[in-house]
């Protein structure tokens, strides 16, 4: 007997599709070997129709695929647009040839069945309503009209024109006529359930002259739509329930043993397991809404249902839509830390992955907020200026082509703790969630700037030094000038880094920046940081105020702008000092500058699709011809 297992018999009808799952034993070889689907001929030969190596036969072109799920030890063959020619014997199997391990599957595709000509068929989804049309002859106009449901022995009344209503249809069934037309009556049944399915007879009049019509009501449960998503990616459940429930509360729930547990609804309920990575977005007045979940985990796989009801909870007889979500562990999205830890006054450098094929896409960073339905206002982007409250302490560094951009946030406070999303205006699957945790600092920061109260005098020379510990000795140190379009790294050379040194004097490691002569444009935030290649690490920030020399005083009162400017973190980083460099300006920041709320983060159409120079986060507007020296003591 074969260790491969699958369905023995599959039957379907023309035009429909099938999804055949084959199970294989849990071994590393099996997970990686070729999977195939072949058709058995009279000679016993089995002709490959599709395989996991990418082969697809002509007769399956455009209508079939084969997906391997190594974490489940299964592979699935999906075949669409079936015809009767697809009827036959097949094998699903493993191995380099079609004589490997396999399982026999019989597929039968039949014609769509014909219905008796005198029966009118109504096909409706659960929770919807149906209006049954019942024609009659004019002579039966004064007679009683009725609708009954056929049972084994009799026909049980649903409703009649004398206002008799079956208890199970009270509030759901209405019998009415339209206008002056005396040849047809209608019965409307709302909030359909599976129990409403069956044969009905509508009747006008009594005895042999009565008008009768047979009705077959089919009530369908929605088929779960299959969603295949990668681990750490995102999924959007697009729910379209119709105008009749537009004003009801909406929900998304996940099927449990006996119930459907609500994950999120528009009344403010949210499952703690999805904290920081879920949004529910009402789309329009037609009952459409979407739920976006980012940072998919293995345990998110399952059977989901969306619906609408005033309670925000699943209710029988109300419209629903369902999905089966599969989370593939063979993910293209790199495994990054989902929790980043910082300390008050310190900094964090967050590496955001994006689809490397979309290096020119616009990159964004938003903060997830759980109030209401949840939303994610953009804080910074390649063409979106930094939000005012993050002035001087937030920047996005794009490294085109390597699949990562970095967001640096410094001068951390405990209020910065929370969930943040990395996203682009390209491939929506690459949305990732980061939880930032901020603890109270218990030691001095790794990087310290002197003087801390930095006021430079116009026209004079001004030097600031950034002290770093020995652990950063081999890394690149840099200074950059912050603007709301990024932090422009000021070119430099680090003499100290080139000197061979056996010991490291903890007290003497510093990188300095000199402004000479100081101009008004030099005023602003400057960052000192470390990085290793393209991996950014700690930063510290200092605000340099520029003032004119006051009479009788060579210095001005220091600004307190640096009260928040100290920093500490545990990553590796850069070494630089400064020389003059004129920098190109960033183009128009695009729609996000005005519409910062990505409440419709799940809706690609809402996202900024403007193209532009997303390849630079630089934004320095320095125009003075200052000299920048690096001093190593």
């Amino acid at each position: 007997k074969s260790p491969i297992f699958g369905p023995q018999e599959v039957s379907s009808i023309e035009g429909d599709s099938v999804s055949i799952t084959c199970y294989y034993p849990d071994t590393s070889v099996n997970r990686h070997t070729r999977k195939y689907w072949c058709r058995q001929g009279a000679s016993g030969m089995c002709t490959t129709l599709i395989s996991s190596n990418g082969y697809l036969s002509k007769e399956y072109s455009g209508r079939a695929n084969l997906i391997n799920f190594p974490e489940n030890n299964t592979f699935v063959i999906n075949i669409e647009q079936l015809t009767q020619d697809d009827t036959g014997s097949y094998k699903c199997g493993l191995g380099t040839s079609n004589r490997g391990l396999s399982f026999d599957v019989s597929l039968e595709v039949s014609q769509v069945p014909e219905l008796p000509s005198d029966t009118h068929v109504y096909t409706k989804d659960i929770g919807r309503n149906v209006t049954i049309e019942c024609p009659f002859k004019r002579e039966n106009a004064p007679s009683k009209k009725s609708l009954c449901k056929k049972t084994n022995q009799s026909c049980e009344l649903v409703i009649d024109s004398t206002e008799k209503v079956n208890p199970s249809y009270i509030g759901r069934a209405k019998l009415f006529m339209k206008g002056t037309d005396l040849t047809v009556f209608y019965v409307n049944i709302s909030h359909l359930t599976h129990n409403d399915a069956g044969l009905y007879i509508c009747q006008a009049g009594e005895g042999p002259s009565a008008d009768k019509k047979n009705v077959d009501l089919q009530v369908l449960a929605p088929e779960p739509e299959l969603l295949y998503k990668d681990l750490r990616s995102s999924v959007t459940f697009e729910c379209d329930l119709g105008r009749e429930v537009a004003n009801e509360a909406k929900y998304l729930c996940r099927m449990n043993k006996e119930t459907c547990d609500v994950i999120i609804n528009t009344l403010g309920k949210r499952d703690p397991d999805f904290e920081g990575r879920i949004l529910i977005t009402p789309k329009d007045d037609n009952g459409r809404f979407s739920v976006l979940i980012t940072g998919l985990r293995k345990e998110d796989a399952g059977h989901y249902q969306c619906g609408a009801h005033s309670s925000g909870l699943p209710q029988e007889g109300w419209p629903i839509q369902t999905w089966q979500l599969f989370v593939n562990e063979e993910s293209t999205i790199p495994n990054r830390r989902s929790v980043v830890k910082g300390v008050t006054g310190g900094s964090v450098a967050i590496a955001c992955p994006y689809n490397p094929k979309e290096s020119s896409s616009l990159k964004y960073w938003c903060r997830w907020e759980g109030d209401g339905n949840g939303h994610c206002p953009v804080l910074v982007g390649t063409q979106a200026q930094v939000q005012e409250e993050y002035e001087g302490r937030l920047a996005l560094f794009d490294q085109p082509g390597n699949g990562t951009y970095t967001v640096i946030l410094n001068q951390l406070t405990t209020e910065d703790a929370g969930f943040y999303w990395c996203l682009t205006n390209g491939d929506s699957r690459w949305r990732t969630t980061i939880e930032l945790q901020v603890a109270e600092a218990t030691r001095e920061p790794n990087l310290e700037v002197t003087p801390q109260n930095a006021t430079a005098v116009l026209g004079e020379t001004f030097t600031v030094s950034c002290h770093y510990p020995c652990k950063f000795y081999s890394q690149e140190k840099y200074w950059c000038k912050w603007s709301n379009k990024g932090c422009h790294i000021l070119p430099s050379h680090d003499e100290g880094a080139r000197q061979s040194s056996v010991s490291c004097d903890q007290s003497s490691q510093l990188v300095s920046m000199t402004l000479n002569p100081v101009s008004k444009e030099d005023e602003g935030w400057y960052w000192c940081g470390v990085k290793q290649g393209q991996t950014y690490g700690e930063t510290t920030a200092i605000y340099i105020a520029v003032e004119e020399r006051t009479r009788g005083s060579s210095h001005v009162n220091p600004t307190d702008a640096n009260a928040r400017a100290k920093v500490a973190l545990e990553e590796e980083v850069v070494d630089s000092s400064i020389s003059e460099k004129e920098n190109k300006a960033i183009p128009n920041p695009g729609p996000f500058a005005n519409e910062r709320e990505i409440q419709n983060v799940g809706d690609q159409a809402q996202e900024n699709r403007a193209s532009g120079d997303a390849g630079s986060a630089d934004g320095q507007s320095r125009s003075s011809s200052s000299k920048h020296h690096h001093h190593h003591h």
Partner: nanobody, 129 residues
Amino acid sequence: QVQLVESGGGLVQTGGSLRLSCAASGRTFSVYRVGWFRQAPGKEREFVAAVIWSGASTYKYAADSVKGRFTISRDNAENTVYLQMNSLKPEDTAVYYCAADPLGLPGPDVRVEGGYRHWGQGTLVTVSS
């Protein structure tokens, strides 16, 4: 909540036939798969057969030990799934359980008990030699 009730069990001679029924009631609209399992005295519960339906398509599964002898079918109108058992053998003696679940395809492995949320109380089948 879905309720499942099995019937049709009994005593039969080797080589005989029986038809087991599994009648579903309650939230039956949310059922997409039904499986039959059996448990012989002193043994673990094992998979016998299953049926999954998805739209107009139906998928039937059977354990190697019953292939060609047992057939699973359903009557949609009556919310009933049948297990037609032919050429019965003494080793088929067991309590037969019906199980159902709202998960269609691909879903969990039909052979695994954990793939079904709703279970019946079971019906005893005894095959005498």
